[in-house]
């Protein structure tokens, strides 16, 4: 029988994955540094814009793919360039933890934009 249309990852699934990769972790991706981003400017695409530059790190590939799927479903998502702090670099683990905190807040308040 024909396969169903692919469901995008849910906010809950993203949270579960972010928890999974950050728990009991002091570092991720060998301490790789990424640009800090303003998550209020379209959190999925903003986070992806920074994290997409991380390679050779299997730990965050699932997160990258989830963000890509969520960013892809936004209207004209590829056109939006998120606000990025070009003078501030932080560790991958810090960005992921920031994203987790932000996404949890969005989830709690039911604002799934």
């Amino acid at each position: 029988s024909p396969s169903p249309v692919t469901p995008s990852p849910t906010l809950k699934e993203l949270i579960e994955e972010l928890v999974n990769i950050t728990q009991n972790q002091a570092s991720l991706c060998n301490g790789s540094m990424v640009w800090s981003v303003n998550l209020t400017a379209g959190m999925y695409c903003a986070a992806l814009e920074s994290l997409i530059n991380v390679s050779d790190c299997s730990a965050i590939q699932r997160t990258q793919r989830m963000l890509k799927a969520l960013c892809s479903q936004k209207p004209a998502a590829g056109q939006i360039s998120s606000e990025r702090s070009r003078d501030t670099k932080i560790e991958v683990i810090q960005l992921v933890k920031n994203l987790l905190t932000y996404v949890r807040g969005v989830y709690r308040h039911g604002n799934f934009r």
């Epitope: 992806l48 890509k68 004209a76 590829g78 360039s81």
Partner: antibody
């Protein structure tokens, strides 16, 4: 060494289904998704979708309008691609591939499986 | 879907010269472009990811550049083994999409 070995060439009738397998070795199967890409004769590459063997999550190219089903068998480290309602436009070489270094950039490819649709 | 337009469709280069292939995206894909080479009867081989990063084992004669919508693959000091079809891929957005390809031949 990462190896992806695909099943042999298939000849199918219009309207039938085909199931191509991709047996993997040399890496941990559940660590990376399996991508499927096809190439019609003398044409370019077309991404069909991927499956994450870790949790069964899939992403499909909607151009295939639900005709593609991707599955993975963790016990044998084998991925499968099934394409239904075959037509002449589906004649192509079908590839499985994995992306290890960069997310969604397929650097390890199977040898390809030619699927022919003929009445 | 993001459309990738590759130019030229074919390219004839003398050994030792430089070949340049362009890939233009229909929308901003940041630096998420990869390049592949495919020889007749073979599977594609990944050369470059994230616009400018070479895979292990790929000669430094291959270089990628660009961001946003305009990307270029350069092959300097072209050798006989560089012939084949070259494809770009955008890996910013789903569905992943490829350019139509550029055939590189030796003069």
């Amino acid at each position: 060494e990462v190896q992806l070995v695909q099943s042999g060439a298939e000849v199918k009738k219009p309207g039938a289904s085909v199931k191509v397998s991709c047996k993997t070795s040399g890496y941990t199967f559940i660590d990376y998704p399996m991508y499927w890409v096809r190439q019609a004769p003398g044409a370019g590459l077309e991404w069909m979708g991927y499956i994450d063997p870790y949790n069964g999550a899939t992403s499909y190219n909607q151009n295939f309008k639900g005709r593609v089903t991707l599955t993975a068998d963790k016990s044998t480290s084998t991925a499968y691609m099934e394409l239904s309602s075959l037509r002449a436009g589906d004649i192509a070489v079908y590839y499985c591939a994995t992306a290890v270094v960069a997310t969604d950039v397929m650097e390890n490819w199977g040898q390809g499986t030619l699927v022919t649709v003929s009445s | 879907d993001i459309v990738l337009t590759q130019t030229p469709l074919s390219l004839s280069v003398s050994p030792g010269e430089t070949a340049s292939i362009s890939c233009k995206a229909s929308q901003n894909v940041r630096n998420a472009v990869a390049w592949f080479r495919q020889k007749p009867g073979q599977s594609p081989q990944a050369l470059i990811y994230l616009a400018s990063n070479r895979y292990t084992g790929v000669p430094d004669r291959f270089s990628g550049s660009g961001s946003g919508t305009d990307f270029t693959l350069r092959i300097s000091r072209v050798e006989a083994e560089d012939t084949g079809d070259y494809f770009c891929l955008q890996h910013w957005n789903y569905p992943l999409t490829f350019g139509a390809g550029t055939k590189v031949e030796l003069k």
